[in-house]
Interface confidence: medium
Amino acid sequence: MSDRPTARRWGKCGPLCTRENIMVAFKGVWTQAFWKAVTAEFLAMLIFVLLSLGSTINWGGTEKPLPVDMVLISLCFGLSIATMVQCFGHISGGHINPAVTVAMVCTRKISIAKSVFYIAAQCLGAIIGAGILYLVTPPSVVGGLGVTMVHGNLTAGHGLLVELIITFQLVFTIFASCDSKRTDVTGSIALAIGFSVAIGHLFAINYTGASMNPARSFGPAVIMGNWENHWIYWVGPIIGAVLAGGLYEYVFCPDVEFKRRFKEAFSKAAQQTKGSYMEVEDNRSQVETDDLILKPGVVHVIDVDRGEEKKGKDQSGEVLSSV
């Protein structure tokens, strides 16, 4: 007879994978505020993909396509994102991008459990947005429906690097613009993010189609059934986003509290015997004040667990409003 605890464990993940811990991981998911946020991500992505992909349609048809108007496409993508961020930022954080969501997970601004719902909503929104565009566009001009493709003279590796770079600059812009620790940020944060998207397009449309957003590439790929080099539009942006988020949050502008805990942990670790590990308790938010809020000044963040307003952090140590 074994002395196993009553709570069943899965695989080799030991004490982490108890039923209780799984439910704790999904704490805050089953609330009205959270589902509003997920729905907002879905709707924002649907509108963004529908509007922005519409600008890529070549009305010259298949016989003699019109020259690609890079400025038109770049502005449409940039302004669409800016508008959606302005509309939905206070509801869901206005990620509208799985790469941004992953970066938020890596910088502990949103839980993995919640990010799963966000990414699913974003992908579904992108598919439906691309689907609507396909339905309303004449077959004679549908073309590739804005499917992102690597330039014929470039390798997948080049494409991956370009996507990494442009997503890096986008996510760095997001983190820097929404940093509540800054007092020098003026003007529209949504526009700053939109311009960052536009700049990425102006540079990279000819290279890779300038995705910077895995869901934006996923939607038309599903509708058109074109999966050529699709993986780079997930791998590149996610790596770029995580690098940008990590560098900003932990290297360039780390939080005072984080620095204190890091030093604490580091000094304790040095005192430990070789080969042993220590457990650092962390049940607090990374920041003490509002973090990554869309509007400058005092802004209230929705507590998705209790469906009420409060400043700064919630019980699970996440900040939802983060673009």
């Epitope: 009305w59 010259g60 048809g61 298949t62 016989e63 003699k64 019109l66 077959p139 004679s140 549908v142």
Partner: antibody, heavy 126, light 110 residues
């Protein structure tokens, strides 16, 4: 008023090269959205598209005849020239040139061959 | 063998209505505008219908065009003896990157 007229030899020997000229008026082949194409019709048979040249010197050819065809334009002379190598008796046909306009580049474009020349009959025989 | 398929011949009495079909594939009719041409005996072809259903100036409204999916139809009402001609459908083919025509339909007015 747009007009086109084909000119060239009426009799060509097998293996020889056919050179046809289309002289047009009423439009310029430097205007965006405009093209000139060549179509042939063997006696008692259907129309067969051969080649097409656009205002920007972009050229398209029938896949089955691509290796034998060359289309060029002389904008200053308002002429389009089609050359067809290695002529064969099966190439006996009436050859037409036609004006093509694209709706996406021009408000009065039709995405069709809207004006045709009268045609020139070419016989390939030894 | 033409890329677009048309019936070889159709016939009807004067004053009657006749339709001529043209079928293709997703790369031609399915994704591009279709045009119809009329070729009177011994004459050059003339554009009859463009962009699926539009008539050039000078073409009477007895002639109409429609398109659905990968097939198209030319309709002629109030048939006249002067309508006796060969009718061709034509369109761009995205796969071939060129113009394609149907095999032609001979219209006989009885």
């Amino acid at each position: 008023q747009i007009t086109l007229k084909e000119s060239g030899p009426t009799l060509v020997k097998p293996t020889q090269t056919l050179t046809l000229t289309c002289t047009f008026s009423g439009f310029s082949l430097s205007t965006s959205g405009v093209g000139v194409g060549w179509i042939r019709q063997p006696p008692g048979k259907a129309l067969e598209w051969l080649a097409l040249i656009y205002w920007d010197d972009d050229k398209r050819y029938s896949p089955s005849l691509k290796s034998r065809l060359t289309i060029t334009k002389d904008t200053s002379k308002n002429q389009v020239v089609l050359t067809m190598t290695n002529m064969d008796p099966v190439d006996t046909a009436t050859y037409y040139c036609a004006h093509r306009s694209l709706s996406s580049y021009s408000s009065n474009g039709k995405d069709a061959f809207d004006i045709w020349g009268q045609g020139t009959m070419v016989t390939v025989s030894s | 063998q033409s890329v677009l398929t048309q019936p070889p011949s159709v016939s009807a009495a004067p004053g009657q209505k006749v339709t001529i079909s043209c079928s293709g594939s997703s790369s031609n009719i399915g994704s591009n505008y279709l045009s119809w041409y009329q070729q009177l005996p011994g004459k050059a072809p003339k554009l009859l219908i463009y962009e699926n259903n539009k008539r050039p100036s000078g073409i009477p409204d007895r002639f109409s065009g429609s398109k659905s999916g990968t097939s198209a139809t030319l309709g002629i009402t109030g048939l006249q003896t002067g309508d006796e001609a060969d009718y061709y459908c034509g369109t761009w083919d995205s796969s071939l990157s060129g113009v394609v025509f149907g095999g032609g339909t001979k219209l006989t007015v009885l």
